[in-house]
Amino acid sequence: HNTTVFQGVAGQSLQVSCPYDSMKHWGRRKAWCRQLGEKGPCQRVVSTHNLWLLSFLRRWNGSTAITDDTLGGTLTITLRNLQPHDAGLYQCQSLHGSEADTLRKVLVEVLADPLDHRDAGDLWFPGESESFEDAHVEHSISRSLLEGEIPFPPTS
């Protein structure tokens, strides 16, 4: 699986989308988990409704919500009031029995600067972060990691 990067702004909401084959995963509940270390387990954060037919209902665990469009084949996770400690590697999963298939690997990055304080197309530098208590705009920027790019910070 390639890793997709979603960048959000601290204090705001970030929406992560995980597309999947709706026929292949028909009848399966979904989950969002956080990867603990490069080779560690994926710790469940939140999962869709226990009744698959009610997967469209948004379920919350703390500041994280999950909802599943089972017909369209899109799992959506919302991270509300994004904070620097939310940065890290996550997975969207499709559950069947005690097994879980990875739908998408996601690297969440937290930007310190609200994007709407800058012109579109300008450069962004983390050292130029501002205070932004009142911002409520949702932003989501995604990209795939470059070949060879490691989604974990160096341990040195």
Epitope: P84, E109, D119, P126, G127, P153, S156
Partner: antibody
Framework: QIQLVQSGPELKKPGESLKISCKAS????????MQWVKQAPEKGLQYMGW????????TYADDFKERFVFSLETSATTAYLQINNLKNEDMATYFC?????????????WGQGTLVTVSS | DIVMTQSPSSLAVSAGETVTINCKSS????????????LAWYQQKPGQSPKVLIY???TRQFGVPDRFIGSGSGTDFTLTISSVQAEDLAIYYC?????????FGSGTKLEIK
């Protein structure tokens, strides 16, 4: 593939002006800022600033606020660096560069450089 | 502006040896939002444009030999070239992209004995 192709070498006299072009191809021009780097003979790399390719707004590093002008011809996916009232210290190779993206500003793509010679 | 202090300014080694180039920044380049160091290393061979070797302080650009290793965090960074080869003759620069304006180290000229 992504390419930045710059105009050829320039020989100018002090006090004259020049305009260097940088033709971008292989990507959506307006998605990425265009940046400029100066390298004087036997010297290191000096960042000059960037131009927002969506709005045309330039941002200059402190040493380049006076006689330097960044501009665009978006339809031709080309960025320009103009230097007015040339001085001897402007003698250098100038590179146009593009970051990996506007949030990760390591320079993934470089033009071949344009050598500017200033001599009376 | 963030000042990047690079050392040594030049060094001459024999093929097969290991080289260490240091880069120190005047402020931390580690961003808490993603735990990444906003530092890159470039190689500039004679008559050529610079080429990125390493970004995020330790991530090798695709196609760069694994002899090139970037390490460090915060303010102190190192580029290590193991088993130096003749084609490594070049000037090496560190660059911070944590803050504007972007700044470079003064360069390290690598010569092969």
């Amino acid at each position: 593939q992504i390419q930045l192709v710059q105009s050829g070498p320039e020989l100018k006299k002090p006090g004259e002006s020049l305009k260097i072009s940088c033709k971008a191809s292989g990507y959506t021009f307006t998605d990425y800022a265009m940046q400029w780097v100066k390298q004087a003979p036997e010297k290191g790399l000096q960042y000059m600033g960037w131009i927002n390719t969506q709005t045309g707004k330039p941002t200059y590093a402190d040493d380049f606020k006076e006689r330097f002008v960044f501009s665009l011809e978006t339809s031709a996916t080309t960025a320009y660096l103009q230097i007015n009232n040339l001085k001897n210290e402007d003698m250098a190779t100038y590179f146009c560069v593009r970051s990996y993206n506007n949030y990760e500003n390591w320079f993934a793509y470089w033009g071949q450089g344009t050598l500017v010679t200033v001599s009376s | 502006d963030i000042v990047m202090t690079q050392s040594p300014s030049s060094l001459a080694v024999s093929a097969g040896e290991t080289v260490t180039i240091n880069c120190k920044s005047s402020q931390s380049l580690l961003y808490s939002g993603n735990q990444k160091n906003y530092l890159a290393w470039y190689q500039q061979k004679p008559g050529q444009s610079p080429k990125v070797l390493i970004y995020w302080a330790s991530t090798r650009q695709f196609g760069v030999p694994d002899r090139f290793i970037g390490s460090g965090s915060g303010t102190d960074f190192t580029l290590t070239i193991s088993s130096v080869q003749a084609e490594d003759l070049a000037i090496y620069y560190c660059q911070q992209y944590y803050n504007s304006p972007i700044t470079f180290g003064s360069g390290t000229k690598l010569e092969i004995k």
